[in-house]
């Protein structure tokens, strides 16, 4: 399945210098994602049709079992490592959702567009987080987990897993935006 975000087993050999005010840029990207998360969630479940819009708690609740943890009271370094893991997980999951939606809802162009725009911001965020980890904390490698592979699921499961992931995304991105 496509991975819109492909982290390398990074050594701290950053080709380009990090942006000035890197943490501000990370905060800004998190705020941007948080600002659009609810609209993306609504757009998604609306596009799936029944029974999704009338069963959000059951079908789109944020119960994603293997989602990477986040501790808002950790050190900056610990929070950045956890943020990195979350962004990788979200990025791969979003890639799967986008791929599935192009098959299941080919005419939902505004949804495809919003998914792609979100993936773009996540890509930039990942780059900035890695830059910060490398430049300030000399962390060049973070063990990550990827979002679930939906390629073998049936139509309903694809839709449901996507909805649960976006419900979780909406929830976690608000926490992340506050924590930084």
């Amino acid at each position: 399945s496509p991975l819109p975000i492909t982290p390398v087993n990074a050594t701290c050999a950053i080709r380009h210098p990090c942006h000035n005010n890197l943490m501000n840029q990370i905060r800004s990207q998190l705020a941007q994602l948080n600002g659009s998360a609810n609209a993306l969630f609504i757009l998604y479940y609306t596009a799936q049709g029944e029974p999704f819009p009338n069963n959000l708690d059951k079908l789109c609740g944020p119960n994603v079992t293997d989602f990477p943890p986040f501790h808002a009271n950790g050190t900056e370094k610990a929070k950045l490592v956890e943020l990195y893991r979350i962004v990788v997980y979200l990025g791969t999951s979003l890639g799967n959702i986008t791929r599935d939606q192009k098959i299941l809802n080919p005419s939902a162009l505004s949804l495809h567009s919003k998914l792609n725009a979100t993936a773009d911001i996540l890509r930039g965020l990942l780059s900035n987080v890695l830059c910060r980890l490398c430049s300030k904390y000399h962390v060049g490698h973070v063990d990550v987990t990827y979002g679930p592979d939906t390629s073998g699921k049936d139509v309903f499961q694809k839709k449901k897993l996507g909805c649960q992931l976006l419900g979780k995304y909406k929830q976690i991105i608000a926490v992340l935006a506050q924590a930084f």
């Epitope: 029944e50 029974p51 599935d100 098959i103 073998g152 699921k153 049936d154 139509v155 499961q157």
Partner: antibody, heavy 119, light 106 residues
């Protein structure tokens, strides 16, 4: 492109058997499901199970088939269906069929293999 | 989990007439419904998928419609070669399902 089932025949009640679905002209490495469907003499189509032949190997079973039927991918061109504790009610023609993502229709079917359960 | 009910179980029609077969899902399956034709001693043949898309090589006399829970297959200008059993199949959810096929219409 062709699917061919084999492994059918006469089986004793309470016996087991393994049916094989062999593909030619495709290999099971892309986004396919292979499904097994059976048809008792003079009756309708009854779905048994499906398997995703990609890396995740997702499987789906009809409620009534869970436990006694096991679908698996055994090579890049074969999928098997193991059936245990056979009874006369399992007498049927067993078809394998292929579907592509999003797995909503069975596009290609094999000719079927007849399983007869009798003492 | 969607279960499929097909009506009628059997019917007769004169050559040149029109046949309407109905298929009802116990819950919404969006538009993920397929229709198959099976002649005695043969394997099933896909006629229609996504409720209304004709499969490759199938005559345009076959028309599918519906969405949600109610679906219809219409055969117009019926020919002797159309004598067969027709089955609907939901392709929306395979989890916790007894059968994805309807009972058939002969």
């Amino acid at each position: 492109e062709q699917l061919v089932e084999s492994g059918g025949g006469l089986v004793q009640p309470e016996g087991s058997l393994t049916l094989t679905c062999k593909a030619s002209g495709i290999d099971f490495s892309s986004n396919y499901w292979i499904c097994w469907v059976r048809q008792a003499p003079g009756k309708g189509l009854e779905w048994i199970a499906c398997i995703y032949v990609g890396s995740s190997g997702d499987t789906y079973y009809a409620n009534w088939a869970k436990g006694r039927f096991a679908i698996s991918k055994t090579s890049s061109t074969t999928v098997t269906l193991e059936v245990t504790s056979l009874t006369a009610a399992d007498t049927a023609t067993y078809f394998c069929a292929r579907t592509v993502e999003p797995y909503d229709n069975l596009h290609f079917w094999g000719p079927g293999t007849l399983v007869s359960v009798s003492s | 989990t969607p279960e499929m009910t097909q009506t009628p179980a059997s019917m007769e029609v004169a050559v040149g007439g029109t046949v309407t077969i109905k298929c009802q899902a116990s819950e919404t399956i969006s538009g993920y419904l397929s229709w198959y034709q099976q002649k005695p001693g043969q394997r099933p043949k896909l006629l229609m998928y996504r409720a209304s898309t004709l499969a490759s090589g199938v005559s345009s006399r076959f028309k599918g419609s519906g969405s949600g829970t109610q679906f219809t297959l219409t055969i117009s200008g019926v020919e002797c070669a159309d004598a067969a059993t027709y089955y609907c199949q939901q392709g929306y959810s395979y989890s916790d399902t007894d059968n994805v096929f309807g009972g058939g219409t002969e």
